[in-house]
Amino acid sequence: KAMHVAQPAVVLANSRGIASFVCEYASPGKATEVRVTVLRQADSQVTEVCAATYMMGNELTFLDDSICTGTSSGNQVNLTIQGLRAMDTGLYICKVELMYPPPYYMGIGNGTQIYVIDPEPCPDSD
Amino acid sequence: KAMHVAQPAVVLANSRGIASFVCEYASPGKATEVRVTVLRQADSQVTEVCAATYMMGNELTFLDDSICTGTSSGNQVNLTIQGLRAMDTGLYICKVELMYPPPYYMGIGNGTQIYVIDPEPCPDSD
């Protein structure tokens, strides 16, 4: 079953390569277990950036080596992606699945264009 | 008389606060004197950033204290805006006027969204 997912059109990564955005879903049912997946689309290729399954109201638990962190609040997920470089500029799509209890719902946002600018290196301190 | 002006939708300023983009116009006539104006639109307010009048094939001459520099090549103007800070993020509109000889033509682009990220300060070198 389809579900509406909203996310901002554009976000700028800060100079430390960190970008944050909110992914909001219009929950048609009362889900307890939710899965959020961040996909990156670049040059018509889609790759999975990170994913987390969480219980409503809890922190999102990503794998230890993930570049993502997040928190949930109601039907909003606050996602932060770190370690971004200029080459990571692209469209980051938020996919939300209401996993359990049934019925299963899935929604995909239109994507957030994340722009990343590599910082200038600091001068050597001699 | 109206004239089509094309410019990129999005440009990122680099970490030194410099953003460059090309403003291209479809010249209906053979102009020798051209005027280029960069306008910034933010919060529904439009302000002039810089302007230069140039003879076709010549350098663009902006005022000494201008934050803009540029070169021209045929119907293309390569604009560079420097000294940008995060607060300068906004829509930069290219306006081109074919001043001489008559007839006068004027065209306005759809604007280039320039994103600016302030760099992290470098650590003190003690």
């Epitope: 307890t32 219980m55 359990y100 049934p102 299963y104 | -």
Partner: antibody, heavy 120, light 107 residues
Framework: EVQLVESGGGLVQPGGSLRLACAAS????????MDWVRQVPGKGLEWVGR??????????EYVASVKGRFTISREDSKNSVYLQMNSLKTEDTAVYYC???????????WGQGTTVTVSS | DIQMTQSPSSLSASVGDRVTITCRAS??????LAWFQQKPGNAPKSLIY???SLQSGVPSKFSGSGSGTDFTLTISSLQPEDFATYYC?????????FGQGTRLEIK
């Protein structure tokens, strides 16, 4: 009546394999998550893993101590969930229960358990 | 992993007594906590879910409370059939984990 019945337990040598089965009846099996929980004789309960439903592509979760050795699968057409146990260790000796995860996430229905003994 | 610590580990009480068992999580688990009763030779039986919701068919003498990290199971008036081992379980985060159990014995 809602019921779960485990089978397939027995004696196996360390390094060996065993496949446990859990047959469900009395409810729409395909709509539920199914879990395996084990209990070393005289000790406490340890969650082994979970199989999600078809809508969630039968994805699974495991406790770290069995990850890579145990695999949970299910056959909705047979109302059954399975626990394939490979590279068994003596510390896997336990009574293995299957349980249904209700929509409120309680493990509300349990089987009677099947005993697995890993010994040389 | 989230550690669940029950106290006491064992408890002696008399028929008619009111007893309380506590369970502490090593981190915030919201209200994603369940309580089970297990008698020797039997499978565990679900008593409480979501910290305080009574499982269908479970008598109201059982009650649960708490949120975050500290939880309690209370049995208001002990009957002979209540002497068993009780386990708490968190289902906030994978892997799901149980407490070590509290053995309730007749005094």
């Amino acid at each position: 009546e809602v019921q779960l019945v485990e089978s397939g337990g027995g004696l196996v040598q360390p390094g060996g394999s065993l496949r446990l089965a859990c047959a469900a009846s009395g409810f729409t099996f395909s709509d539920y998550y199914m879990d395996w929980v084990r209990q070393v004789p005289g000790k406490g309960l340890e969650w082994v893993g979970r199989s999600r439903d078809k809508a969630n592509s039968f994805t699974t979760e495991y406790v770290a101590s069995v990850k890579g050795r145990f695999t949970i699968s299910r056959e909705d057409s047979k109302n059954s969930v399975y626990l394939q146990m490979n590279s068994l260790k003596t510390e896997d000796t336990a009574v293995y229960y299957c349980a249904r995860t209700n929509y409120d996430f309680s493990l509300d229905v349990w089987g009677q358990g099947t005993t697995v003994t890993v010994s040389s | 992993d989230i550690q669940m610590t029950q106290s006491p580990s064992s408890l002696s009480a008399s028929v008619g007594d009111r007893v309380t068992i506590t369970c502490r999580a090593s981190q915030d688990i919201n209200n994603y906590l369940a309580w089970f009763q297990q008698k020797p030779g039997n499978a565990p039986k679900s008593l409480i879910y979501a910290a305080s919701s009574l499982q269908s068919g479970v008598p109201s003498k059982f009650s649960g409370s708490g949120s975050g990290t500290d939880f309690t199971l209370t049995i208001s008036s002990l009957q002979p059939e209540d002497f068993a081992t009780y386990y708490c379980q968190q289902y906030s985060t994978y892997p799901i984990t149980f407490g070590q159990g509290t053995r309730l014995e007749i005094k």
